[in-house]
C-alpha cells in the first residue's frame, strides 16, 4: 500500500501585501485509479456535484491544479451522476494533476477507487479520510489560496517551500 | 466466476487460538474488502471485521482485543486469528466479499467451528 | 449504536404477499443501507435485496425492498409466495465502519 505524502500550504495575505505561509503535512494513500506519481498545483475544492455537469465551457481552471472533492455519505445521493471513479477521471479531463478525495463520510469509495486499476489515470489519485482529512477540509474550507504537493515519499526536512 | 472458501481446524480447545484462512479466486484482493462474519447455532449473524482493498482492517469493537485480520495478496488468502477461544465461540464462520457499497455480494460456504475441550 | 429489529418467524400461505419487517431502533431508517439476505437451511446466505430497494441479478422480481418511514423500518415483501421462500431473511446495515445484522426471521409456507 502506497502512503501518499501531502503538504499543503496555505498564503495568507498580510496588510502590507506580504504573504505570511503555513504548511501543514499530512498523510493519504494513492490509490488503484491513478499512478503513483508527485505532484503540486493549486488547490481547487470541488462540490461531487460540481463535476457532474458536462459542459466543456466549464474549464475555468488552468492545467495543473488539485481538485479536492469531499465525498457525502452515499445515501445523500442515492443516483450519482457518476462513480467515483467517473468523478476522478473528469477532474483529470478538466485540468486536474491530481485529485485528492476526503472519504470519511463514504469510507466504501476506497474499494470503488482500487477498482480502478484496469484503466488507471496518468495522475494521481489520493483519498484521505480520519484525522488527516480533517486536517485538509480545514484549510480549504478557508477559501484562501492554498498549494498542495504530493509526494510518494516523505518529504526533505527542512520543508521546502514553494517557489511562487 | 468469483469464490471465496474457507477452512481451518473443526475443534478448537477452549483458551486456544482459532486460525482460519479464507482462499479467494475471480477477484483481487486489493480492489475489493474480505469480510468475516460468524453465525452462531441460534441463528443470529454478527459481523466480525473486514480487511479493506488497501489491506487496512475494521474491527467489531466487540472483538477488537483478540481478532485479527491480515492477507496475502500473492496468494489470494486473508487470514482470521482469534485468540482466547471460549464455548460461545463456537458457530460456523464465513468469509464474504464487498466492494465498494456497504453489502456482502459474495459469501463462501462457511466453517463449522467447535469450542470444546 | 442502533439496533435492528426483526419478528423471530412469520407463516404465510401459498400463492399469498408477505411482508417481512426490519425495524431501526434510533435514528433516522433512511440514513443508512439496509439490505436483505436469504438462507437455506444449512447453506450461506445470498443478498436478496440490497441499498433498500436495489434487486440483484437473478432474483425473482417477487421480492422488493421499501422504506416504511411511519415505524422506522425497512420492508422485503414477498409477492406470490412460493414453497422454495422458505428461508430465514436477515436484514442488515452499518454505521461508522460497523456493520450490523437484525436477528432474522423464519419463514414458513403452508
Known amino acids: 500500500k502506497e502512503t501518499a505524502f501531502v503538504e499543503v500550504v496555505l498564503f495568507e495575505s498580510s496588510p502590507s501585501g506580504d504573504y505570511t505561509t503555513y504548511t501543514t503535512g499530512l498523510t493519504g494513500r494513492f490509490s488503484r485509479a491513478g499512478a503513483t506519481l508527485s505532484a503540486e498545483g493549486e488547490i481547487v475544492q470541488m462540490h461531487p456535484l460540481g463535476l457532474c455537469n458536462n459542459n466543456d465551457e466549464e474549464d475555468l481552471y488552468e492545467y495543473g491544479w488539485v481538485g479536492v472533492v469531499k465525498l457525502e455519505q452515499p445515501e445523500l445521493d442515492p443516483k450519482p451522476c457518476l462513480t467515483v471513479l467517473g468523478k476522478a477521471k473528469r477532474a483529470v479531463q478538466r485540468g486536474a494533476t491530481a485529485v485528492i478525495f476526503d472519504v470519511s463520510e463514504n469510507p466504501e469509495a476506497i474499494d470503488q477507487l482500487n477498482q480502478g486499476s484496469e484503466d488507471p489515470l496518468k495522475r494521481p489519485v489520493v483519498y484521505v479520510k480520519g484525522a488527516d482529512a480533517i486536517k485538509l477540509m480545514n484549510i480549504v474550507n478557508k477559501q484562501k489560496v492554498a498549494r498542495a504537493r504530493i509526494q510518494h515519499r516523505p518529504p526533505r526536512q527542512p520543508t521546502e517551500y514553494f517557489d511562487m | 466466476q468469483v469464490q471465496l472458501k474457507e477452512s481451518g481446524p473443526g475443534l478448537v480447545q477452549p483458551s486456544q487460538t482459532l486460525s482460519l484462512t479464507c482462499t479467494v479466486s475471480?477477484?483481487?484482493?486489493?480492489?475489493?474488502?474480505v469480510h468475516w462474519v460468524r453465525q452462531h447455532s441460534g441463528k443470529s449473524l454478527e459481523w466480525m471485521g473486514r480487511i479493506w482493498s488497501d489491506g487496512d482492517t475494521s474491527y467489531n469493537s466487540a472483538f477488537t482485543s483478540r481478532l485479527s485480520i491480515s492477507r496475502d495478496t500473492s496468494k489470494s488468502q486473508v487470514f482470521l486469528k482469534m485468540n482466547s477461544l471460549q464455548t460461545e465461540d463456537t458457530g460456523t464462520y464465513y468469509c464474504?466479499?464487498?466492494?465498494?457499497?456497504?453489502?456482502?455480494?459474495?459469501w463462501g460456504q462457511g466453517v463449522m467451528v467447535t469450542v470444546s475441550s | 449504536q442502533f439496533v435492528l429489529t426483526q419478528s423471530n418467524s412469520v407463516s404465510t400461505n401459498l400463492g399469498s404477499t408477505v411482508k417481512l419487517s426490519c425495524e431501526r431502533s434510533?435514528?433516522?431508517?433512511?440514513?443508512?443501507?439496509v439490505n436483505w439476505y436469504q438462507q437455506y437451511e444449512g447453506r450461506s446466505p445470498t443478498t436478496m435485496i440490497y441499498k433498500f430497494d436495489q434487486r440483484p441479478d437473478g432474483v425473482p422480481d417477487r421480492f422488493s425492498g421499501s422504506i416504511d418511514r411511519s415505524s422506522n423500518s425497512v420492508l422485503l415483501t414477498i409477492n406470490n409466495v412460493q414453497t422454495e421462500d422458505e428461508a430465514d431473511y436477515f436484514c442488515q446495515s452499518y454505521s461508522s465502519d460497523m456493520y450490523i445484522f437484525g436477528g432474522g426471521t423464519k419463514l414458513t409456507v403452508l
Open positions: 475471480g477477484f483481487s484482493l486489493t480492489s475489493y474488502s
Open positions: 434510533i435514528g433516522n431508517i433512511g440514513s443508512n443501507y
Open positions: 464474504d466479499r464487498s466492494g465498494g457499497s456497504p453489502f456482502f455480494d459474495y
